[in-house]
């Protein structure tokens, strides 16, 4: 039997503090060869699975969980885990998603990252794609 699977990591784009109505993408990362990622809420009672895995680097794969329009109900603690070769990994650390109005110039909306490229372009998505619709991600009510 192989050794323990590497622990996944979790992050959020554009950040963990999101104004109501704005989008957020939670990103889970693990090793190459992950078959499925799972994003869980704190109590494990609600989760979302995906097999839409892409490469984050030569040694990492990732999955992205998008919420188009966050509400107070989306606030809370999230963590990731994954399946590789029929084995489940450990959980990632918790990510605390905060939904609140941010201070500052209200005429400057939070910038929305490209959900397939993120803040830095990843080679798996380097096909100069112009065909991705602007905002058809998973809505909050479908996610949880």
């Amino acid at each position: 039997q192989e050794g323990p699977l590497p622990r996944p990591s979790i992050s959020a784009e554009p950040g963990t503090v999101i104004p109501p109505g704005r989008p957020v993408t939670i990103v889970c990362r693990g090793p190459v060869g992950v078959d499925q990622f799972r994003l869980e809420r704190e109590d494990r009672s609600k989760f979302n699975d995906t097999k839409d895995v892409s490469q984050a680097s030569p040694s990492e794969s990732e999955a992205r969980f998008r919420i188009d329009s966050v509400s107070e109900g989306n606030a809370g603690h999230y963590r990731c885990l994954y399946v590789k070769s029929t084995r489940w990994s450990e959980h990632s650390d918790y990510l605390d998603l905060v939904v609140k109005e941010t201070s500052g110039d209200t005429d400057s909306p939070v910038t929305e990252p490209d959900s397939s490229a993120g803040p830095t372009q990843r080679p798996s998505d380097n096909s100069h794609n112009e065909h991705a619709p602007a905002s058809q991600g998973l809505s909050a009510e479908h996610l949880y």
Partner: antibody, heavy 117, light 107 residues
Framework: EVQLVESGGGLVKPGGSLRLSCAAS????????MNWVRQAPGKGLEWVAR??????????YYADSVKDRFTISRDDSKNTLYLQMNSLKTEDTAVYYC????????WGQGTLVTVSS | DIQMTQSPSSLSASVGDRVTITCLAS??????LAWYQQKPGKAPKLLIY???SLADGVPSRFSGSGSGTDFTLTISSLQPEDFATYYC?????????FGGGTKVEIK
Amino acid sequence: EVQLVESGGGLVKPGGSLRLSCAASGFTFNINAMNWVRQAPGKGLEWVARIRTKNNNFATYYADSVKDRFTISRDDSKNTLYLQMNSLKTEDTAVYYCVRGPYFDYWGQGTLVTVSS
Amino acid sequence: DIQMTQSPSSLSASVGDRVTITCLASQTIGTWLAWYQQKPGKAPKLLIYAATSLADGVPSRFSGSGSGTDFTLTISSLQPEDFATYYCQQLYSTPYTFGGGTKVEIK
């Protein structure tokens, strides 16, 4: 049992159009990225297009050889993948396979597209 | 685009032989590599993904190794049903390019 069944192939003249369909069953279609791969007679494999899931804005990617002529799409409510092929050329003649991503682990049986005058 | 160079393009071997096929990527792809087997008139079948992981239902005589730019598919003891064409494919970046194929024939 995972099944991918392609349809819509046939004989078409250069410049014509065809729409391929792939009916998926036996797995949760809407959480999987999907691909089209083709194989010209007696030749090797060529990746054609990829479509991601709703979580990824249904982002699409194409081989340069088909960009601006082919469009990949999906209908998750029908568990169906599509490939709309316009401005077809003789070099598009091939067997077209529907393939589950990201590791190309399940393939359909293929549908033959022949472009000839 | 990443080019995948597969060698040899064909080989003749006997049942029981150890067979090695190599694939060279034009730039580093980590372990984002898959190997497929295709028999005439049939769809390809996934053998190896993530360079070294055996796909479901694939016999253990098949193994994959390598990372970065150099990869190998090994069949430890060739069986009659293994005579086929084998392809590598990089899954690191689109377009997801395939190698040219290796036809394994009966000696």
